[in-house]
Structures are given as C-alpha cells and as structure tokens.
Interface confidence: low
C-alpha cells in the first residue's frame, strides 16, 4: 500500500512567492523621455512586467505626504501629488488584483526626514498609523510595511497592536516590519510578541560571503525561529548590489529563492541594478534601467546588458535566472513549503535539501568562494526522510556551460568559483 500523503499546510499568498519592493516610484518609473505620467499610473503600465517576474506582492512607497521632520505636515491618508492621486492608486489596486498581484503599502511616517518615527512624538505618530491602517484596509490594500522600527520606542507593543488591526480586518492581510539591525537577539525579541509578523532585516548582509558563515547564519536563524514563517533578504530596503559584488548576485538569487520562507527583493535586483554605475543617482534609489534611454543624461553610460530590455533577450542573463527561479519557487511543493535540511559539503560551500512528502526534491549547493571546489556531500548529516541519491538532475547552474537536465554524480560534484547549483531528484520510498 502506498504511504499516506502528508497533509498540505495552510498557505497564505505571501507564502507562495517573492515580494518586490518599489521604495521610490519615480526612480522605478525611470527618467527617460515619455515618462510624464504620474508614477503611480506609470507603475500600472509595468504590471505585465511584474507578472513576468512571478512576484506575488508589491511593497509600495511610502507615497504619503511627508514634510521632512514635520509631524503636523505628515498625512498618512493623503498621497503626495508627486506620485499621483488617490484615483490613480485605486486604479492601480484594481489592475493589480486582476493580475493576482497584491499591493502592500509602506507607511513609514517620516520617510523624508532624519528619524523615521519622529522620536519625540511617538504617541501622536502611533495614532496616525492606526488611523491609516483602517483607512487603507478599507481602500483595498493587502498589507503594510513599516521600516526602521529600531527607531520606534516600544516597537513590539505597537507592532502587536497594528498586527491586530490588520489581521482583524482579514487573516489574508500582511504586516511587514523592517529593521536595520543584523543582531539575532534584537530580531528575535521583535518576533517574540508578533507571531505572524514578517520581518526584514540586515541579518544576512553580514554573511561575509563565505559558505560556512552563511550556512551558520541561516541555520541559527531557522533554529531560533522554530517553525514560524520567515522572510529572506539582505536588508529592509536596499538593493543587493549595495552589499554584494556582481559575481555573487546569481548565487544569492538562487539562495533567497530556495530557502524556506518568503524572498523579498528590491526593484532592480533582478537585473543587478547598481547605483554606482549611474553618476548622480542616489545609492538608495537609482533609476530603473528599462532600456538604454532610461538614463538619458549620459549617452553611452548604459549598455544593453544592464537593462531589462537587453537582459530579457538574453537567456543567460541575471533577469532570466530570476524569472526561472521565481517560477520554480511558485510551483514546486518542496520549495513552496518543504522541509529544509542543511548539511556539510566541504569548506566554502553551503548545501541544503528541500523536500515535501512524495514530491520531487531539490538539492542546492552554493560555492561562495573565489576558487573551484569539489563538493564532499555528507549525507550522514541528513535524516532518513531526506537521504541523497547517487545522482541528481541539474535543473540550473548560476554559471553558463553546464548541460541542464543532465544527471550529475553527487560524489563527484565540482563547482566553479561563485557557482550555485539547483538539482532535482525524485522521492524514493
């Protein structure tokens, strides 16, 4: 008799794929000729692109009125006219819904100012946030984000209260909190009193780009948070290129998409957008490179392989890799909600298995180092339910040159510098 199938866990929409942050709508829209529409309307025109990325939610803004450091001139219920109107926003919500893309609104109050939370007027601000949650929930948003919560006094209790409002409206609504902290204890104390909170932090940004260190960070985090759902990113707002050299971008994409939890990216992460390439552009919000005309001030500064258009036409590009990983992440049960087991594969490497019941299983092997390495996969580290076969099929490599679909002998696995492999193998009873 076949073994009984394991009961599927209840999955919310944010469990099913990546979130995509658009912190600066004007930068996302691009400054190229013809971009005269209000940025919110411009974003509506980019929903097909976002659908092609298979992202499940957009984290938008902040877009509310905020006069720098002036609490009286900060209105969380009003959209800053620089971004568009309430009508533009309603229209965006409707269009996004039709494409099954959820919209999360960032309500970080003083986003233009020194202290995001007007430290001296916390109670006034907290009341404004409460009112805004109710207002925007009624308007149809799917969730909220608040950032820099390390600057919010009594953050845990405020977050619990805001979580109650959000979940009270519907269990299908999400609250994301962001912190600049990379300290595990601080992160755990924020999570302690907020069971369903999704927290983005700088925890992984300190990975030191070595396989062992990254493995230890990930496993420590998962052990400490138990079986609660988590998110994976390198920071609460910034681009991957702020933290990573170009040669590690593919590796991190593969890792973020295959760890157990919700991957969270910033606009431009899918193409390796880097502010350093665009003189005069702010590090935290460089212009999105849709094509070579997106940065018109400097003829020749932007080459095709830096843009969405150029990378869309190249099956070996970072964007193509992002799309493939996002697709796998959103449809494979083992990646959607499978168990996770990290195991030893040798110095410099980080490897783990994702598996769910009798579904196809996935093996991830990541080489963070600058030298090629042979993987010594230590299957003895794994529980019986997650044993390794002798061979696994190559689903994809972050480096060109390997034949996809070909079976690889796991005992003889060699990885190029900065190479990540995603391998698949069937369940064996």
């Amino acid at each position: 008799r076949a073994p009984r199938c394991r009961e599927l866990p209840a999955q919310k929409w944010w469990h099913t794929g990546a979130l995509y942050r658009i912190g600066d709508l004007q930068a996302f829209q691009g400054h190229g000729a013809g971009n005269l529409a209000a940025p919110i309307s411009g974003l509506k025109g980019r929903l097909d692109y976002l659908s092609s990325l298979k992202v499940k939610g957009l984290v938008l803004g902040p877009i509310h009125k905020n006069q720098k450091d002036d609490v009286a001139q900060t209105d969380l219920l009003q959209i800053d006219p620089n971004f568009g109107s309430k009508e533009d926003f309603d229209s965006l919500l409707q269009s996004a819904k039709k494409k099954s893309i959820r919209v999360i609104l960032d309500l970080t109050p003083n986003y233009r100012g020194e202290n995001s939370w007007f430290s001296t007027q916390v109670d006034t601000v907290a009341t404004k946030v409460k009112d805004a949650l109710e207002f925007w929930l009624q308007a149809g948003v799917d969730g909220f984000q608040v950032r820099d919560i390390e600057n919010l006094k009594d953050a845990s209790s405020f977050l619990a209260e805001w979580q109650n409002i959000t979940k009270g409206f519907s269990e299908d609504r999400l609250l994301i909190a962001g912190t600049n902290s990379s300290d595990l204890q601080q992160i755990l104390s924020l999570l302690e009193s907020n069971k369903d909170l999704l927290l983005t932090s700088s925890y992984l940004s300190d990975s030191g780009s070595t396989g062992e260190h990254t493995k230890s960070l990930v496993t420590q985090y998962l052990n400490a948070t138990g079986n609660r759902w988590c998110s994976w990113s390198l920071s609460q707002a910034r681009l991957l290129t702020s933290f990573l050299p170009a040669q590690l971008l593919r590796l991190y994409q593969l890792m973020l998409f295959t760890l157990p939890g919700t991957p969270v990216f910033s606009y431009g992460d899918e193409i390796g957008l880097d502010a350093a390439a665009l003189p005069g552009q702010p590090m935290e919000a460089p212009v999105m490179l849709w094509d070579e005309s997106s940065f018109p001030d400097i003829p020749g500064a932007v080459s095709a392989n830096m843009t969405v258009k150029g990378q869309s036409e190249d099956p070996g590009s970072l964007l193509s890799l992002f799309r493939r990983l996002s697709d796998q992440r959103s449809k494979e049960r083992s990646l959607l909600h499978g168990d996770f087991h990290a195991f030893s594969a040798g110095p410099g490497l980080f490897s783990y298995i994702r598996h769910w019941d009798q579904n196809e299983r996935f093996l991830v092997v990541l080489n963070f180092g600058d030298v090629g390495l042979s993987a010594g996969l230590q299957a003895s580290d794994l529980p019986a339910s997650a044993s390794l076969p002798a061979k696994a099929d190559l689903l994809l490599s972050t480096q060109p040159g390997r034949e996809e679909g070909s079976p690889l002998e796991l005992e003889r696995l060699k990885l190029e510098p900065h190479e990540g492999l995603l391998l698949r193998f069937p369940y064996a009873a």
């Epitope: 170009a246 390796g272 350093a276 390439a277 003189p279 005069g280 001030d297 400097i298 003829p299 830096m306």
Partner: antibody, heavy 125, light 108 residues
Framework: QVQLVQSGAEVKKPGASVKVSCKAS????????MHWLRQAPGQGLEWMGW????????NYIQKFQGRVTMTRDTSISTAYMELSRLRSDDTAVFYC??????????????????WGQGTLVTVSS | EIVLTQSPGTLSLSPGERATLSCRAS???????LAWYQQKPGQAPRLLIY???SRATGIPDRFSGSGSGTDFTLTISRLEPEDFAVYYC?????????FGQGTKVEIK
Amino acid sequence: QVQLVQSGAEVKKPGASVKVSCKASGYTFTGYYMHWLRQAPGQGLEWMGWINPNTGDTNYIQKFQGRVTMTRDTSISTAYMELSRLRSDDTAVFYCARIRVYYESGIYNYPLHHWGQGTLVTVSS
Amino acid sequence: EIVLTQSPGTLSLSPGERATLSCRASQSVSSSYLAWYQQKPGQAPRLLIYGASSRATGIPDRFSGSGSGTDFTLTISRLEPEDFAVYYCQQYGSSPWTFGQGTKVEIK
C-alpha cells in the same frame, strides 16, 4: 569626444577671490558630476569636492568649507569654482574633472577619466 | 579620511627596466575603487588603472595594477622613455576622495 576646457591663468592678491571656469563639450553636461581638484607647485593632488550640474547640489571637503563655491550654468555647459579670501599658500593649479563609467564582467567603476588642462592661480602681493 | 602613502618617493631606473610602485592605505579600500594616474610636467593627470587592476581605455599593457585591502601595487613591466613621470594612487570609495603624495620615476 569629451572635452573640458578651463579658463586662463590668473594672478591675485591675498584676500581676493578667483573664479575658474570649466566648459564641457562632447557629452550631456547635466549627466555627470563635475569634480574640482587642486595641486600646489611640486605637490600632490587634492580633491576639493563636486557639483551636480543637474541639480546644483554641491559637496565640499571640510578644508574648503566657507571659502569655496561651486556653481554651473547649464545653458552654456560650464562649471565654475570660486575660491575666496585667497592666501599665498592657495597658489596652485586647479583642475576640473569628470568620471567615466566603466562596466565589465558585471562590475561597475567610475574613476576620474576626463580632466581639464588646468588653471594656474598665483596668489602674490 | 583614508590616508594613502606611496613608496618610494623617487625611483631611479633605466629604460627597459621593471618599475614597482607601492601604495598603502591607512584603512581598507574596496579594490573596486583604487586608481593610478600618471602626470607629466605641465600636464593634467592621466588615468592608467581603475578598480585596482583594470587598465583604462588606451593604456598599454605594460602597465598593470594589483592588490587589495590596504596594499596596492602599480607595475610597469618595461619602462619606455615616455613613462618617466610622477604616479599617483587615489581612492574613490569613501568621501573625501584622497590621493597618495606621488612617486617620481626618473631616468637613472
């Protein structure tokens, strides 16, 4: 091709001001920061700061704060650097310079690639 | 600010010889943001190397750069007559951008 052409040599008395110009051609002037540097006779190079010709935003190093003013006139693609309250130790060649974006193997870089020919400012009583 | 110290101050060599110039930083510099410039009397500096080891457009391959962290080197494999000049290293990874005091390569 990119060219930065600076104004001619100047002789100034201590306490006076000098304004050096840098006319850009061969690229969109508003697209790149303009950097200013100086070099005293027989000495090394010293970076003074930059102006963003697009917005007029400036960034000066501490040493020159209060004495230097960088401006631009986008209609004639020209940047200016004015140094006031001149002293004899301000005698130097002043350069304007512009970065170039290099992109290869997925890595970006932006060193100072294009330089003006330099303007000698002599401060002497 | 990051202080860059170049050594030696002067290097006396003959054409055809190999020149090795050193640049040491007071704190770690991202190797992506270290450049070398050549300057001849009465001329503006000319970019030779950026990103510690990449040659700028039009620079002959006898010039090469290496190093990371706090120690960087410019090597001229075989000195040509036109290579006798002053060489500066510069970091542009953190503000303020700073230069070394220069190394003069003179004919022996």
